[in-house]
């Protein structure tokens, strides 16, 4: 599954074929760039797009429907979490049920928690409906424990 990385110098997407890849933490152009030891927080996010219908095209990444929806969702998340500590999203999956979207979000550790991930996504739903014609409902966010994610970050500056 392609991965969208949050670029800190432009709004463009980069791609990776690695399944759970995260951008290298030293590639940001922040002058306070995190070191390699800086942790990453992962969140699993699921939501319904109630104004779209699932079909077999969403099981095939080569189809226009799949690529267009993935692009819109990737752009939407770059808008929502722009951008201080947002590292990107990966593992976008589409499931039946109108369209159920599942993905993983990566953030610089210590910069956000599960409640604020959900809050900011919910705050953006109205704009998503008008900008991308996506009617979003049934949002669910949970922490993803990750082995290389260090303990919560007293060392992460604001």
């Amino acid at each position: 599954t392609p991965t969208t990385l949050a670029s800190h110098s432009t709004k463009t997407d980069a791609s990776s074929t690695h399944h759970s890849s995260v951008p290298p933490l030293t590639s940001s152009n922040h002058s306070t760039s995190p070191q390699l030891s800086t942790g990453v927080s992962f969140f699993f996010l699921s939501f319904h797009i109630s104004n779209l219908q699932f079909n077999s095209s969403l099981e095939d990444p080569s189809t226009d429907y799949y690529q267009e929806l993935q692009r819109d969702i990737s752009e939407m998340f770059l808008q929502i979490y722009k951008q201080g500590g947002f590292l990107g999203l990966s593992n976008i999956k589409f499931r039946p049920g109108s369209v159920v979207v599942q993905l993983t979000l990566a953030f610089r550790e210590g910069t956000i928690n599960v409640h604020d991930v959900e809050t900011q996504f919910n705050q953006y739903k109205t704009e998503a409906a008008s900008r991308y014609n996506l009617t979003i409902s049934d949002v669910s966010v949970s922490d993803v424990p990750f082995p290389f994610s260090a303990q919560s970050g007293a060392g992460v500056p604001g």
Epitope: I80, Q83, G85
Partner: antibody, heavy 119, light 107 residues
């Protein structure tokens, strides 16, 4: 290191406007939200709104919408807040404060700018 | 709008004493609460984020706890330099809101 340096104190007449600046250094200005917070004399803190300098996206507290305009100049890494139709109740210290996201906490603050509205 | 109510409004303690401030939210906000210290004529300073996460450079005597609607900030051995106003702030909903503050005084 991250620094937010605000412009100096202002004394304004009721009905006029004022534009406060917040010059930043030590980080990628375009990539973080800049928030503005008000503190009236002897009172608590009140969030006014925020701007994302990367694309100019803004969010305002409904209480201040229409009388506050937030802008940012990427070329000088400076955020601005303009207050219009000033009334005496606008007398306060105004702070700029940096955050990672739209909804977040503020680890870096400007030193504050006192705006006094008096006839 | 989420209302944050801090108590007490004033707290007077002797040095080395433990002090606890509370912040109550008008609705559940998970752990999306942050604490600031503001000394006279200074900018606020972040002490604790997300209810209990420590901040680099902040003395370890400051700690936070709570979730849902009830939160506390504790100073386990007050020093004279801790004289300040203390504010909680929520990031769970727009507009971002602050509590009215608690003033700490040293006896």
């Amino acid at each position: 290191q991250v620094q937010l340096v605000q412009s100096g104190a202002e004394v304004k007449k009721p009905g006029s406007s004022v534009k406060i600046s917040c010059k930043t250094s030590g980080y990628a200005f375009s990539n973080f939200w800049m928030n503005w917070v008000r503190q009236a004399p002897g009172q608590g803190l009140e969030w006014i709104g925020q701007i994302y300098p990367g694309d100019g996206d803004t969010n305002y507290n409904a209480k201040f919408k229409g009388r506050v305009t937030l802008t940012a100049d990427k070329s000088t890494s400076t955020a601005y807040m303009e207050l219009s139709s000033l009334r005496s109740e606008a007398t306060a210290v105004y702070f700029c404060a940096r955050s990672y996201y739209r909804s977040a906490w503020f680890a870096y603050w400007g030193q504050g700018t006192l705006v006094t509205v008096s006839s | 709008e989420i209302l944050l109510t801090q108590s007490p409004d004033f707290q007077s303690v002797t040095p080395k004493e433990k002090v606890t401030f509370t912040c109550r939210a008008s609705q559940s906000i998970g752990t999306s609460i942050h604490w600031y210290q503001q000394k006279p004529n200074q900018s606020p300073k972040l002490l604790i984020k997300y209810a209990s996460e420590s901040i680099s450079g902040v003395p370890s005597r400051f700690s936070g706890s709570g979730s849902g609607t009830d939160f506390t900030l504790s100073i386990n051995s007050v020093e004279s330099e801790d004289i300040a106003d203390y504010y909680c702030q929520q990031s769970n909903n727009w507009p971002l809101t602050f509590g009215q503050g608690t003033k700490l005084e040293i006896k």
